[in-house]
C-alpha cells in the first residue's frame, strides 16, 4: 500500500462542541431537505478497495471538492450554520495540503470521481444531498485522520 | 439487538460443495457488511470474505476460484458456497457483522458458529 | 498477506494480575490493530479497534496500545471472566488477518 505522509490532524480539531454541533446541525437541516434517500455518498463504497491508513488522504479529497464543488456555490443557504461550518472546514482542508500519498492513489481517485460524478448527476440535490452527509464527512475525517 | 446465526450440514463429503446461511437480526444488510471466518480445530481465524452492504463481494485469494458468497436481503440471509471441499476444510464457520461504514473491517458482532466436518 | 505473530501462545495468571500480551505484524499497519476475545460456547467478542479504542461495553480494565508493527493488549486486574483466548487482527488491509491466539489460563 502507498506510504502517506503529513495526513494527520489534531484530535482536538474534533474535539470542539460548538463548531461540532454547528455542523451536525447543518447537516441535519440540509438532510431535511433531501428528498433522495436512496443515494449515498459517504459508505462503505467510498472505502472500497482503500485501506485504512490511506483513509485521510481519500478524505481530504473528499473534504476540497465539497468545498469547492459543493460549500462554496451554496454558500448563502442554511444559515446562519453555513458561514461557521465553511471556514472551519477550510481550515481543516488547509491542515491537510501536505498530506499525500507516495505510489500509485488511482484507486482512491477512482472512488472520489465515483463521489464526483455522483453529485454532478443529482445537479443541485447532489449538493443538498453532501451538505446533509457533513456530519459523515465529519465523522469520517476524524477516524481517518486522527 | 444484533445477532447472527449459521446453519447448514454439520457433514459434508470430499469434493462436494459446502453451503452455510448466516440469519441475520437487529440490522439491515443494506447497511452493514458481513464476513465469514472460519477457525480449524484448535486454530487461529482465517478471514474468508466479505458480502458488502451494496451486494457486492470481497475474497480471500486463498479461497477465490472456490468461494462464492450471496445474500438474500428479503430473508435477512447470507449465505456461504465452498466448492470441492477437502478434509483441510473441516473447521467451524463464522459470520460476522461490520462495527460501522467506516470500520468495515472491523468485526464487531459475530455468531457462534457452526462446524462442518469433511469426510466420507 | 500480512502475518500477525501472538505472543506468548499461553499464559497462565492469577485473579487481580496485570496480563500483557503482544502481537507483531510482518509489515506496518499504522494504529489499525483490533483485539478479540474468544470463549467456548459463546459468541466472539471485539474489546478494541484502531489499536486503542474501547469498544462499547468493552471494561476499562483492558488497554490497547502500539503503532506500526507492535502492539499490547493489557488487562491490568484479571478477572475470572477474562479467562480465554485472545485473537489480534489487522484491520487496516485485505486480507484480514489474525494471530495465532493467546489462551489466558487460570494459574
Known amino acids: 500500500a502507498p506510504i502517506s505522509s503529513h495526513c494527520r490532524l489534531d484530535k482536538s480539531n474534533f474535539q470542539q462542541p460548538y463548531i461540532t454541533n454547528r455542523t451536525f446541525m447543518l447537516a441535519k437541516e440540509a438532510s431535511l431537505a433531501d428528498n433522495n434517500t436512496d443515494v449515498r455518498l459517504i459508505g462503505e463504497k467510498l472505502f472500497h478497495g482503500v485501506s485504512m491508513s490511506e483513509r485521510c488522504y481519500l478524505m481530504k479529497q473528499v473534504l476540497n471538492f465539497t468545498l469547492e464543488e459543493v460549500l462554496f456555490p451554496q454558500s448563502d443557504r442554511f444559515q446562519p450554520y453555513m458561514q461557521e461550518v465553511v471556514p472551519f472546514l477550510a481550515r481543516l482542508s488547509n491542515r491537510l495540503s501536505t498530506c499525500h500519498i507516495e505510489g500509485d492513489d488511482l484507486h482512491i481517485q477512482r472512488n472520489v470521481q465515483k463521489l464526483k460524478d455522483t453529485v454532478k448527476k443529482l445537479g443541485e440535490s447532489g449538493e443538498i444531498k453532501a451538505i446533509g452527509e457533513l456530519d459523515l464527512l465529519f465523522m469520517s475525517l476524524r477516524n481517518a485522520c486522527i | 439487538e444484533v445477532q447472527l446465526q449459521e446453519s447448514g450440514p454439520g457433514l459434508v463429503k470430499p469434493s462436494q460443495t459446502l453451503s452455510l446461511t448466516c440469519t441475520v437480526s437487529g440490522f439491515s444488510l443494506t447497511s452493514y457488511s458481513v464476513h465469514w471466518v472460519r477457525q480449524h480445530s484448535g486454530k487461529g481465524l482465517e478471514w474468508m470474505g466479505r458480502m458488502w452492504s451494496d451486494g457486492d463481494t470481497s475474497y480471500n485469494t486463498a479461497f477465490t476460484s472456490r468461494l462464492t458468497i450471496s445474500r438474500d436481503t428479503s430473508k435477512s440471509q447470507v449465505s456461504l458456497k465452498l466448492s470441492s471441499v477437502t478434509a483441510a476444510d473441516t473447521a467451524v464457520y463464522y459470520c460476522?457483522?461490520?462495527?460501522?461504514?467506516?470500520?468495515?473491517?472491523?468485526?464487531?458482532?459475530w455468531g457462534q458458529g457452526t462446524t462442518v466436518t469433511v469426510s466420507s | 498477506d500480512i502475518v500477525m505473530t501472538q505472543s506468548p501462545s499461553s499464559v497462565s495468571a492469577s485473579v487481580g494480575d496485570r496480563v500483557t500480551i503482544t502481537c507483531k505484524a510482518s509489515k506496518t499497519i499504522s494504529k489499525y490493530l483490533a483485539w478479540y476475545q474468544q470463549k467456548p460456547g459463546k459468541a466472539n467478542k471485539l474489546l478494541i479497534y484502531?489499536?486503542?479504542t474501547l469498544q462499547s461495553g468493552t471494561p476499562s480494565r483492558f488497554s490497547g496500545s502500539g503503532s506500526s508493527t507492535d502492539f499490547t493488549l493489557t488487562i491490568s486486574s484479571l478477572q475470572p471472566e477474562d479467562f480465554a483466548t485472545y485473537y489480534c487482527?489487522?484491520?487496516?488491509?485485505?486480507?484480514?488477518?489474525f494471530g495465532q491466539g493467546t489462551k489466558l489460563e487460570i494459574k
Open positions: 460476522a457483522r461490520s462495527l460501522d461504514f467506516y470500520y468495515d473491517t472491523t468485526l464487531a458482532f
Open positions: 484502531s489499536g486503542s
Open positions: 487482527q489487522q484491520h487496516n488491509e485485505y486480507p484480514l488477518t
